[in-house]
């Protein structure tokens, strides 16, 4: 054969990924790697994976003589070492003007009064501990709640007798029950005073309160 | 408080086995890698394996020195971590440590060590 | 594997002197490095991790810094109950190895 067709091993060289060819005889060469790859001809990219230190959770993805980590959203950093901060991150994580609080591996909302949940996003059910009497209705509210009487009943939780049920009031005066006390109140017409509405008063005065 | 609480160290003959024991509390035992670690008298400390947590399945790795000799598991309904030695020799002779990998590539709490001597 | 060169071996200080360990890793360890103090017949504390974060309840005049191949400890006011040996360790990846050992002696 002519000198054309002479087989020289390292030209081109046939080492990839950046090894070097050093000619080792007439016809044979080695490939001296680069960290982080193997084989004859350095095509092989060595899996640094089974050494990982993935922390908390985090995923070992193979890189060139080194691996990174996939972390969970909780965790950030080359190794998922650091803490990511909800907080910072989501200012509103917490809903109904909870405070978030930061944790290693997550965050946690501190309820203002009336709500409850992860995020605070559940109104608690204050009727679970309500005293409403029974037979009367209860209403949830943040926080607080409220009792919604049956007919002849009255007061904040409809423990009283409503005043109001035997017509107290005279001459077409308004009754109200104070929630408190479950006594009467007459809204006067024009021209009535005293505590029933039953007495006259002069012209120029009108709609007074009375309390029984 | 996390606590961490070897057993099982003794006298064995070369050629024979020993089975290490690591009592722990304070923590969830299945998040953490935990790590076994040796050092013999008066020298430095040498890491002979890992077990990784749930969430790596519980993956193992050992140091060279140990391989094909000695097992590491663990038991989470026990909270137990266990060396099972086999094939001792006189260089294994050292106290072990079992310690847990805190999430911060390093080792936050020890055990107070168990003594291993490989003696005839 | 990744060798640790920690040193010195051994050193004399005084009560508030400030005291310098050294460790090199043969190669990158992307700040994966930690510090231990162990006292005759006791288990090592971590004091450092990370490179440069104090471990909790670690006084402070202990502290890390370095970062690639190359990291220190100091302390910087030595203390009587700081009189003990220290080791670092890489956790960049398994298996874990340790330098050697410094042992920090009352001069």
């Known amino acids: 054969a002519g000198s054309d067709s002479l087989y020289v091993p390292c030209a081109p060289s046939p080492c990839v990924n950046g090894g070097t060819c050093r000619q080792t005889g007439d016809f044979t060469f080695e490939c001296n790697c680069l960290p982080g790859f193997e084989g004859s001809t350095c095509e092989r990219n060595i899996d640094d994976c089974p050494n990982h230190r993935c922390q908390n959770g985090g995923v070992c993805v193979d890189g060139v003589n080194t691996y990174n980590c996939r972390c969970p959203p909780q965790w950030t950093g080359q190794f998922c070492t650091e803490d990511v901060d909800e907080c910072l991150l989501q200012p509103n994580a917490c809903q109904n003007g909870g405070t978030c609080a930061n944790r290693n591996g997550g965050y946690g909302c501190v309820c203002v009064n009336g709500w409850s949940g992860d995020d605070c996003s559940e109104n608690i059910d204050d009727c679970a501990f309500a005293s409403c009497t029974p037979g009367s209705t209860c209403i949830d509210r943040v926080a607080s709640f409220s009792c919604m009487c049956p007919e002849g009943k009255a007061g904040l939780l409809c423990h009283l007798d409503d005043a109001c049920i035997s017509n107290p009031c005279h001459k077409g005066a308004l009754c109200d029950t104070n929630p408190l006390n479950g006594q009467y109140i007459c809204t006067c017409p024009q021209g009535y005073k005293g505590a029933d509405c039953t007495e006259d008063v002069d012209e120029g005065n009108s709609h007074h309160h009375h309390h029984h | 408080e996390v606590q961490l609480v070897e057993s099982g160290g003794g006298l064995v003959q070369p050629g024979g086995s020993l089975k290490l024991s690591c009592a722990v509390s304070g923590f969830t035992f299945s998040d953490f890698y935990m790590e076994w670690i040796r050092q013999a008298s008066g020298k430095g400390l040498e890491w002979i394996a890992a077990?990784?947590?749930?969430?790596?399945?519980?993956?193992?790795v050992y140091s060279a020195s140990v391989k094909d000799r000695f097992t590491i598991s663990r038991d989470t309904s026990k909270s137990t971590l266990y060396l099972q030695m086999n094939s001792l020799k006189t260089e294994d002779t050292a106290v072990y440590y079992c310690s847990r990998d805190g999430g911060k590539l390093a080792l936050d709490a020890w055990g107070q060590g168990t003594l291993v001597t490989v003696s005839s | 594997d990744i060798q640790m060169t920690q040193s010195p071996s051994s050193v004399s200080a005084s009560v508030g002197d400030r005291v310098t360990i050294t460790c090199q890793t043969s190669e990158d360890i992307y700040s994966g490095l930690a510090w231990y103090q162990q006292k005759p017949g006791k288990s090592p504390k971590l004091l450092i991790y990370g490179a440069s974060r104090l471990q909790d309840g670690v006084p402070s005049r202990f502290s890390g810094s370095g970062s690639g191949t190359d990291y220190t400890l100091t302390i910087s006011s030595l203390q009587p109950e700081d009189f003990a040996t220290y080791f670092c360790?890489?956790?960049?990846?398994?298996?874990?190895?340790f330098g050697g050992g410094t042992k920090v002696e009352i001069k």
């Open positions: 360790q890489q956790g960049f990846k398994y298996p874990l190895t």
């Open positions: 077990q990784r947590n749930k969430a790596n399945d519980f993956s193992i």
